[in-house]
Amino acid sequence: QPEQKTLSLTGTYRHVDRTTGQVLTCDKCPAGTYVSEHCTNTSLRVCSSCPSGTFTRHENGIERCHDCSQPCPRPMIERLPCAALTDRECICPPGMYQSNGTCAPHTVCPVGWGVRKKGTENEDVRCKQCARGTFSDVPSSVMKCRAHTDCLGQNLMVVKQGTKETDNVCGVHLSSSSTTPSSPGIATFSHPEHTESHDVPSSTYEPQGMNSTDSNSTASVRTKVPSDIQEETVPDNTSSTSGKESTNRTLPNPPQLTHQQGPHHRHILKLLPSSMEATGEKSSTAIKAPKRGHPRQNPHKHFDINEH
């Protein structure tokens, strides 16, 4: 329906009347419409709604609406549909982010690493090494490092010290025994730490999503764990959450985590972050068997103060 009311419009535009050559000042049409007929000395301009597939965002004096952008290319999805007032807006679906004009999967932080910063549709996930007292036993693009179960807090003993990749394993406390096998001494930043965990060489592997390099690689798979990494079994009593499982094992062709390496993924010194990371204190169960994800090398540790 052509609109001629101008009460709510304050903007004007100049138009040259082709028949008289006179320069006229006409009222603009509102957003979502266009000027189907310019004003004359004796009549107001006429506004018409934008046809399907076109739009105008602002009040205007144009003779045709703008064409909407092309349909979203897969795997993008529409954030905003093409409508009279808005152009079509495409975004990457959940679990992906826009990189170099396309969508790339969020980095998957490997075992021993956790999410330092959540990914968005425009930014990749940033990973961080699990710090002392925390662990991550599954590759994930959404999970943070979690604090080791506090066995002592449940009046249980530590049957097996946790590492950056495994939780503590708690066992029934023998009341007759005053010793708590490798009981986690102190925790550095929040849950029972694995104080006597093994310092497993975690090779220099870093999930790309953790790199601070400003590369905008859009590869769909990242975070590879070197297949030649061997874990040491030398206990590093100094680091409570630094190691991996104490059993020696050579990582078999480590599964490749799909993840985008972005300049993001910093988990460094998370203020002494690694352990400082998750806030979600995990509820511990009386007896917890370590979850075993793919044997992943235990990468590096960072000041991780982030919590869940």
Epitope: R132, I268, K270, L272, S275, N298, P299
Partner: antibody, heavy 115, light 110 residues
Framework: EVQLLESGGGLVQPGGSLRLSCAAS????????MSWVRQAPGKGLEWVSS????????LYADSVKGRFTISRDNSKNTLYLQMNSLRAEDTAVYYC????????WGQGTLVTVSS | QSELTQPPSASGTPGQWVTISCSGS????????VYWYQQLPGTAPKLLIY???QRPSGVPDRFSGSKSGTSASLAISGLRSEDEADYYC???????????FGGGTKVTVL
């Protein structure tokens, strides 16, 4: 026994440069994130910079960004902090710390920036 | 000024219980683990508590940490003269994307 030993501190004029080193021993250096934390005379602790175990990622406090560079040589078990364009406010004892939890600290090295 | 707020000082007599608070926000303490460090006069800081409430081996059980919401606290029971030191809380700050320390609390044993 985990040991971290800083060196390289000293007196330097404003605008000058210094390179701090932190020699690590007693643990597998290449497995850990390392950080620098400083403490101005009579003041509290201030995080300065961190670096991943492989050196692939670094992080800096806004106050030193663009002036300081953290690096590491895993073959030498050594952490470095290159400090350029030093200012009077950079005067402090600089500590290197291990892991995201900063579970071990060196004894510190004093950097004095004064004319 | 620090993102984490600690009282500048705290004191107690031997045997007493002293608590130090550390107040932050959702972007730091509220969503991350808290760490506590002890710095004895003239020495380097030492990790005292990690992941909110865990003690590294060698740290007496007189020291305990806790966290609730956007605040954390360090409790020292059975205060001893050797506990006289500066205590710092620390955590990660999601907004700053950096670690942050509290201003420190000087504990004096009267």
């Amino acid at each position: 026994e985990v040991q971290l030993l800083e060196s390289g501190g000293g007196l330097v004029q404003p605008g000058g440069s210094l390179r701090l080193s932190c020699a690590a021993s007693g643990f597998t250096f290449s497995n850990y994130e390392m950080s620098w934390v400083r403490q101005a005379p009579g003041k509290g602790l201030e995080w300065v910079s961190s670096i991943y175990s492989s050196g692939g990622e670094t992080l800096y406090a806004d106050s030193v960004k663009g002036r300081f560079t953290i690096s590491r040589d895993n073959s030498k078990n050594t952490l470095y902090l290159q400090m350029n364009s030093l200012r009077a406010e950079d005067t402090a004892v600089y500590y290197c710390a291990r892991d995201g939890a900063a579970d071990y600290w060196g004894q510190g090295t004093l950097v004095t920036v004064s004319s | 000024q620090s993102e984490l707020t600690q009282p500048p000082s705290a004191s107690g007599t031997p045997g007493q219980w002293v608590t130090i608070s550390c107040s932050g926000s959702t972007s730091n303490i509220g969503n991350n683990y808290v760490y506590w460090y002890q710095q004895l006069p003239g020495t380097a800081p030492k990790l005292l508590i990690y992941t909110n409430n865990q003690r590294p081996s060698g740290v007496p059980d007189r020291f305990s940490g806790s966290k609730s919401g956007t605040s954390a606290s360090l409790a020292i029971s059975g205060l001893r003269s050797e506990d006289e030191a500066d205590y710092y809380c620390a955590t990660w700050d999601d907004s700053l994307y950096a670690p942050v320390f509290g201003g420190g609390t000087k504990v004096t044993v009267l």
